[in-house]
Interface confidence: low
């Protein structure tokens, strides 16, 4: 009870999740790789590794670039995070998945879910990624 | 309950530009997209374009561009379109719709450009 | 811009008569969305993702289709079903709308 919890700089996860539908669309939040910035005074860069398809604003938004159908080849990519003044360099994997049509849905109420989901109102157009205790 | 409720019906002269509002209850607004639709009288729909509020992205339909300013404002919860150089071609019923299907429609603002 | 094509643009139907209307889109979409309008009243989504039913549409409604090709179907007509039907594509922006078909009671 007396534990201090140390602030670790870097990326919270090793993945970041986010369930979404079929169509992605140009502008469209993705998900928040939010970066923990202990001192508060790192000014930090993001990048993406697919910056053709995804783009990373200064508070850690993912969104899409274009529109595009979620597909395989988009299902797993790099964001780096880069400290201006150290050069210092961070990454973290973005994985999204293709959320189920709603009777799909229905069907597996039981099975399991990961951690991090995209609730019922975040979805084919919109979105920012919320943590979800389940 | 969900509601997108428009603002009310307008009579505008031709040149002059119009403001019409789209207030949303019952959901976190910046959680969905907001589109607009226009229907002229007897005809089908058109649409004109988004604004995802949550980062301020717009989207046109290249035919709106220039005539359709999408804006909105997250402290109220409100989308905002403003059409501007109005000509009679402009008179129709206006929708603003948003969902995660585009499930929700406001009951559509009434325009209408005569002199 | 992909042109959604809907046919037909009028027609009539029987009470207890099966109902198919069709929309093509000029290029090839992912899915297809539907929308029931009544007259002086706000469309309503009718059908999502190609087949999906909106919440509250009755079971006799149905939709498929995959690529250029899209229709809805009414298993057994009602008064209640007469309306106007839009497609709507989100795959690319435009999000264009179809001309609508007009279901009629015979």
């Known amino acids: 009870s007396g534990e201090i919890a140390l602030c670790k700089t870097g990326f919270p996860e090793d993945v970041y999740s986010a369930v979404l539908s079929k169509d992605v669309h140009e502008g469209q939040p993705l998900l928040n790789v939010k970066f923990s910035n202990c001192n508060g005074k790192r000014k930090v860069q993001y990048e993406s590794s697919e910056p053709a398809d995804f783009k990373v604003d200064e508070d850690g938004m993912v969104y899409a670039v274009r529109s595009f159908p979620l597909s395989s080849e988009h299902a797993k990519f790099l964001i780096y995070a880069q400290d201006k003044e150290t050069q210092e360099k961070w990454q973290v994997a973005v994985k999204l998945s293709l959320k189920p049509t709603l009777t799909e849905e229905s069907v597996k109420e039981s099975a399991e879910v990961e951690e991090i989901v995209f609730p019922r109102q975040f979805s084919k157009h919109s979105g920012h990624l919320q943590r979800q205790k389940r | 309950e969900v509601q997108l409720q428009q603002s009310g019906p307008e009579l505008v002269k031709p040149g002059a530009s119009v403001k019409m509002s789209c207030k949303a209850s019952?959901?976190?607004?910046?959680?969905?997209?907001m589109h607009w639709v226009k229907q002229k009288p007897g005809q089908g729909l058109e649409w004109i374009g988004y604004i995802n509020p949550y980062i301020d992205v717009t989207k046109y339909n290249e035919k709106f561009k220039g005539k359709a300013t999408l804006t909105s404002d997250k402290s109220s919860s409100t989308a905002f379109m403003e059409l501007s150089s109005l000509t009679s071609e402009d008179s129709a019923v206006y929708y603003c719709?948003?969902?995660?299907?585009?499930?929700?429609w406001g009951q559509g603002t009434t325009l209408t450009v005569s002199s | 811009e992909n042109v959604l094509t809907q046919s037909p643009a009028i027609m009539s139907a029987s009470l207890g008569e099966k109902v198919t209307m069709s929309c093509r889109a000029s290029s090839s979409v992912n899915y297809m969305y539907w929308y029931q309008q009544k007259s002086d009243a706000s469309p309503k989504l009718w059908i999502y993702?190609?087949?999906n039913l909106a919440p509250g549409v009755p079971d006799r409604f149905s939709g498929s289709g995959s690529g250029n090709s899209y229709s809805l179907t009414i298993s057994s007509m009602e008064g209640e079903d007469a309306a106007t039907y839009y497609c709507?594509?989100?795959?690319?922006?435009?999000?264009?709308f179809g001309s609508g078909t007009k279901l009629e009671i015979k």
């Open positions: 019952g959901y976190t607004f910046t959680s969905y997209l």
């Open positions: 719709a948003g969902g995660d299907y585009e499930d929700y």
């Open positions: 993702y190609t087949s």
């Open positions: 709507q594509q989100f795959s690319s922006p435009p999000f264009t």
